[in-house]
């Protein structure tokens, strides 16, 4: 029979191949039907009968047309530091991604095995490189003329405000404090106010990183804080 009108199972022509969504069964030496996603081969084909497919059992899946005897097991439930971005169904594996404020510290073939909390830069240090799906925050000391007074995984070092008269000089962890030069705003001569800059400056803040989109599976490994690095705090 010509291949295009043959019904499975059929013997392929010499040197020929089986059609789309069919496979060559070595035992039967026939082209046989594959099973659709969400199913598996319950009974393999013979020379006279085609593949018998059955639905995947609970918590298992097949994503492709196949002739596997058993569906693949879905990954473990997502751990508390992860978000389930794709549920386990008959046709797809569960996907767990790191929740906001976390990154993938230990990846695996299909995504994340272990999430870890993003490093927080302590006062006097700002974010040099923001965290990504797969990398931690890098902190750096605030350069002269800049400061950070927060413990944050997103804040960068910001410039000190510029004062006509400085009451308290700024340092790496504190903004400069200006002396008031406007008597109408002053409660007492030379009173210190927080703050009254001459020139405004834009707030240099980083947006919070989006959660990781690397697919993965929780392996229920213990998750502790990331090891402290210079200028970081392990919360």
């Amino acid at each position: 029979l010509p291949a295009q009108v043959a019904f499975t199972p059929y013997a392929p022509e010499p040197g020929g191949t089986c059609r789309l969504r069919e496979y060559y069964d070595q035992t039967a030496q026939m082209c046989c039907s594959k099973c659709p996603p969400g199913q598996h081969a319950k009974v393999f084909c013979t020379k006279t009968s085609d593949t018998v497919c059955d639905s995947c059992e609970d918590s298992t899946y097949t994503q492709l047309w196949n002739w596997v005897p058993e569906c693949l097991s879905c990954g473990s439930r997502c751990s508390s530091d992860q978000v389930e971005t794709q549920a386990c169904t008959r046709e797809q594996n569960r996907i767990c991604t790191c929740r906001p404020g976390w990154y993938c510290a230990l990846s695996k073939q299909e995504g994340c095995r272990l999430c870890a909390q993003l490093r927080k830069c302590r006062p006097g240090f700002g974010v040099a490189r923001p965290g990504t799906e797969t990398s931690d925050v890098v902190c750096k000391p605030c350069a002269p003329g800049t400061f950070s007074n927060t413990t944050s995984s997103t804040d960068i070092c910001r410039p000190h405000q510029i004062c006509h008269v400085v009451a308290i000089p700024g340092n790496a962890s504190m903004d400069a404090v200006c002396t008031s030069t406007s008597p109408t705003r002053s409660m007492a001569p030379g009173a210190v106010h927080l703050p009254q800059p001459v020139s405004t400056r834009s707030q240099h803040t980083q947006p919070t990183p989006a959660p990781s989109t690397a697919p993965g599976t929780s392996f229920l490994l213990p998750v502790g804080p990331s090891p402290p690095a210079e200028g970081s705090t392990g919360d």
């Epitope: 609970d58 879905c74 473990s76 439930r77 549920a87 386990c88 229920l220």
Partner: antibody, heavy 120, light 108 residues
């Protein structure tokens, strides 16, 4: 919120049949299984079977092979378990419970139970 | 069928005690498919630990679960009055799915 509400207590004679219902609310019946588990007085839990309400596919302990029938009515989100040829040892509280597909069979919500008494 | 055997069948303990319940399967069970339920008299069972070691929301952190293969345990680090109940292990690895016979935790 998720609720499973079962039908009331039944008293049956040996040889009769009983049909227990379990109405689900607060969740989509898609991608879940509904199980039936029973507990004889003073005894442990015994799994009877389960149904996929969306497809009507069932699976049960071979022990109940010829006596149990599980059905579902998707229009009312209700599943039913019928046990025939009742005997005294079928006296038990019958529970329905759900397990979401992908949760490895963990039954996270249970009905309040239906006491079935088989007595002549 | 996979038989699930719990030990002890019952135990008496005091508030504050550390309690361990074991569940032994007659053949290997994947840890994802091993669950524990708590049941109090006249009430329906409640899912207490899922997939060997995970606590559903609302279950106190004094409960923990561990194990693999054929041996699994439920541990209560410091027994509280509300923990007195019967605990059942349950395997969903192979049909027919089976429960242990239960372990009743009573007040000493």
């Amino acid at each position: 919120q998720v609720q499973l509400v079962q039908s009331g207590a039944e008293v049956k004679k040996p040889g009769a049949s009983v049909k227990v219902s379990c109405k689900a609310s607060g969740f989509n019946n898609k991608d879940i299984y509904m199980h039936w588990v029973r507990q004889a007085p003073g005894q442990g839990l015994e799994w009877i079977g389960r149904i996929d309400p969306a497809t009507g596919n069932t699976k049960h302990d071979p022990k109940f092979q010829d006596r149990v029938t599980m059905t579902s009515d998707t229009s009312t989100n209700t599943v039913y378990m019928e046990l025939s040829s009742l005997r005294s040892e079928d006296t038990a509280v019958y529970y329905c419970a759900r397990s979401p597909y992908g949760d490895f069979g963990a039954m996270d919500y249970w009905g309040q139970g239906t006491l079935v008494t088989v007595s002549s | 069928d996979i038989q699930m055997t719990q030990s002890p069948s019952s135990l008496s303990a005091s508030v504050g005690d550390r309690v361990t319940i074991t569940c032994t399967a007659s053949s290997s069970v994947s840890s994802n498919y091993l669950h524990w339920y708590q049941q109090k008299p006249g009430k329906a069972p409640k899912l207490w630990i899922y997939s060997t070691s995970n606590l559903p929301s609302g279950v106190p952190s004094r409960f923990s679960g561990s194990g693999s293969g054929t041996d699994f345990t439920l541990t209560i680090s410091s027994l509280q009055p509300e923990d007195f109940a019967t605990y059942y292990c349950h395997q969903y690895h192979r049909s027919p799915w089976t429960f242990g016979q239960g372990t009743k935790v009573e007040i000493k």
